[in-house]
């Protein structure tokens, strides 16, 4: 018979034949042959593989480093990685939760809608037209543009979401 060019789901092609992939939680020891099945071995303690695979090494479980404020939210198994979270009152810097911050700051152009608490991180909002923020802050709201008119001045430079307007003297009519 013709050697296969593609294999079924949960199989892989090697040496012109289809071998079974190793199930999650196991790694490949040896490929199948004409006469033998794929040989797989369970991952060791603190290791995992989360897909049907032909990996020869299992992945190490993530380490939740307490020096970075991390703790284990969910212990890893042979099929799943460890999930880290931050100590109470702290917040993950990313979805992967690789480090912790007390709270995040809102970038220039954004103001603080709600200051962080023990359970929720800072909530930022974009500065609307007429408001600006030129700093990174965990407490400052967007500030309204300066009103040049109330100072008997005119707008020399328009404001943006990151900068205030620049006011200047009114042009005097020449006689």
């Amino acid at each position: 018979p013709e050697p296969p060019t593609a294999c079924r789901e949960k199989q892989y092609l090697i040496n012109s034949q289809c071998c079974s992939l190793c199930q999650p939680g196991q790694k490949l020891v040896s490929d199948c042959t004409e006469f033998t099945e794929t040989e797989c071995l369970p991952c060791g303690e603190s290791e995992f593989l989360d897909t049907w695979n032909r990996e020869t090494h299992c992945h190490q479980h993530k380490y939740c480093d307490p020096n970075l404020g991390l703790r284990v939210q969910q212990k890893g198994t042979s099929e799943t990685d460890t999930i880290c979270t931050c100590e109470e009152g702290w917040h993950c810097t990313s979805e992967a939760c690789e480090s912790c911050v007390l709270h995040r700051s809102c970038s220039p152009g954004f103001g603080v809608k709600q200051i962080a608490t023990g359970v929720s991180d800072t909530i930022c909002e974009p500065c609307p037209v007429g408001f600006f923020s030129n700093v990174s802050s965990a407490f400052e709201k967007c500030h309204p543009w300066t009103s040049c008119e109330t100072k008997d001045l005119v707008v020399q430079q328009a404001g943006t979401n990151k900068t205030d307007v620049v006011c200047g003297p009114q042009d005097r009519l020449r006689a």
Epitope: W90, S99, C100, V101, L102, V135, A138, E140
Partner: nanobody
Framework: EVQLLESGGGLVQPGGSLRLSCAAS???????EMWWVRQAPGKGLERVS?????????YYADSVKGRFTISRDDSKNTLYLQMNSLRAEDTAVYYC?????????WGQGTLVTVSS
């Protein structure tokens, strides 16, 4: 790497005053937003007060408004918290924090006990 060292805590009677200091080493605090945060025994972290990098804007939690004053002296690389009219519920370990507020910047804190 910045290190923050809080000091000035102690035992004080209700109605008394204390001034906390936070001295930074290894990095300047100039231009950086700074916070005072506290943790009462068996409670979570509470954000008490903050000051902008310029010193022009401040924030106070409702629980300390009118009693606490935050200030900074960038030439001394130090943040302060003046605490007046202290109450039993102000008893906590007080920490200072510097933008970007990483856990590994966290100091040891200074314990404030308000008791008669």
């Amino acid at each position: 790497e910045v290190q923050l060292l809080e000091s000035g805590g102690g035992l004080v009677q209700p109605g008394g005053s204390l001034r906390l200091s936070c001295a930074a080493s290894g990095s300047t605090i100039a231009g950086y937003e700074m916070w005072w945060v506290r943790q009462a025994p068996g409670k979570g972290l509470e954000r008490v007060s903050a000051i902008s990098g310029s010193g022009g804007s401040t924030y106070y939690a409702d629980s300390v408004k009118g009693r606490f004053t935050i200030s900074r002296d960038d030439s001394k690389n130090t943040l302060y918290l003046q605490m007046n009219s202290l109450r039993a519920e102000d008893t906590a370990v007080y920490y200072c924090a510097k933008d970007p507020y990483s856990f590994d910047y966290w100091g040891q804190g200074t314990l404030v006990t308000v008791s008669s």
